[in-house]
Amino acid sequence: QGWQAFKNDATEIIPELGEYPEPPPELENNKTMNRAENGGRPPHHPFETKDVSEYSCRELHFTRYVTDGPCRSAKPVTELVCSGQCGPARLLPNAIGRGKWWRPSGPDFRCIPDRYRAQRVQLLCPGGEAPRARKVRLVASCKCKRLTRFHNQSELKDFGTEAARPQKGRKPRPRARSAKANQAELENAY
């Protein structure tokens, strides 16, 4: 039997179990250099010389329930939120800083999910439906990844999901939100 696929705010039900390395998204912000933002310094391209491992990409743990329309996981799941500015740590603003110290004019990097893990959850539904098992895809690690010019930011992470098939002996439920709406919320977390 196939696993039903659906999107959650920060999760996705998946058909297979395992770890999922993600190819780097082909994206770019397409922003131009602004000297005022750069503190009047000459253009600097830190990403051309610095190793990606030096960039600050934080993995923040957070806990939430998986939802599908009126259904909700019996228990919350814990996953990572990718956070942070993907620039060399020495150039990032500290706690006292009042804004960006620089904006790279070269390739744009973002802190986004790198690997995923699958976890089974138990989904509880109202209205006399029996609980059922689902596999959900959770962020397992984050990485600074290069964005290219071909796509806009709204497509930063667009998982493909198949439409949910109605279960036998049960009425199909309307989706709570569209995949795109969930995607936008997911991206805003970054």
Partner: antibody
């Protein structure tokens, strides 16, 4: 107090049919999900079927799918299990069980009250 | 479906603590229920949703569930606790209520 009384069990030949009943009392029957669970002689428990309070959702174990049909008559406070194409491996004590629900989502849907069971023997 | 595995038997001296395990892949993400069944009788729910006791069940019965193992704990075990114990949970992709194989608790 809550009472569940099963009936309709007996000896039947392989390929035959039988209809089990479960008379409920002591609670608002139509508000509760009900289940059938069976236990072969000397073996463990096996869930058979589930029906929601308004009969809109029914589920079955793979072992009985297509052969058994669960239904209910809320006006009579009675749960049924129609068993067709019976096999020797269907021989068991059949229990009807009320599902315990709490909170908006019902919780994990455990079975808080059970009948005493009715024995179904499939043999030639 | 997730298979639920229980030890066939557990023995305990009166007054001691009995622990019955129920293992299954990531069962900690699922609500687990425990049933007690004495010979010739119908099952009785003793723990629901991992660690909740129905009314009328003695306080010595408790449950926990984490990772790959759910556990039923009976503190100060009494002779009347001798019975078969089953764990269970809705673990199917299409709803399926799965019982563990059962554990026979013997009070020595």
């Amino acid at each position: 107090q809550v009472q569940l009384v099963e009936s309709g069990g007996g000896l039947v030949q392989p390929g035959g049919s039988l209809r089990l009943s479960c008379a409920a009392s002591g609670f608002t029957f139509s508000s509760y999900v009900m289940n059938w669970v069976r236990q072969a002689p000397g073996k463990g428990l096996e869930w058979v079927s589930f029906i929601s309070g308004d009969s809109s959702n029914t589920y079955y174990a793979d072992s009985v799918k297509g052969r058994f049909t669960i239904s209910r008559d809320n006006s009579k406070n009675t749960l049924y299990l129609q068993m067709n194409s019976l096999r020797a491996e269907d021989t068991a004590v059949y229990y009807c069980a009320r599902t315990f629900m709490h909170g908006h989502l019902g919780g994990g849907l455990s079975m808080d009250f059970w009948g005493q069971g009715t024995l179904v023997t499939v043999s030639s | 479906d997730i298979e639920l595995t229980q030890p066939p038997s557990v023995s305990v001296a009166p007054g001691q603590t009995a622990r019955i395990s129920c293992s299954g892949d990531n069962i900690g993400s699922f609500y687990v229920h425990w049933y007690q069944q004495k010979p010739g009788q119908a099952p009785v729910l003793v723990i629901y949703d991992d660690n909740n006791r129905p009314s009328g069940i003695p306080e010595r019965f408790s449950g926990s569930n984490s990772g790959n193992t759910a556990t039923l704990t009976i503190s100060g075990t009494q002779a009347e606790d001798e019975a078969d114990y089953y764990c269970a949970s809705w673990t199917g992709v299409e709803p399926d209520y799965v019982f563990g194989g059962g554990t026979k608790l013997t009070v020595l």
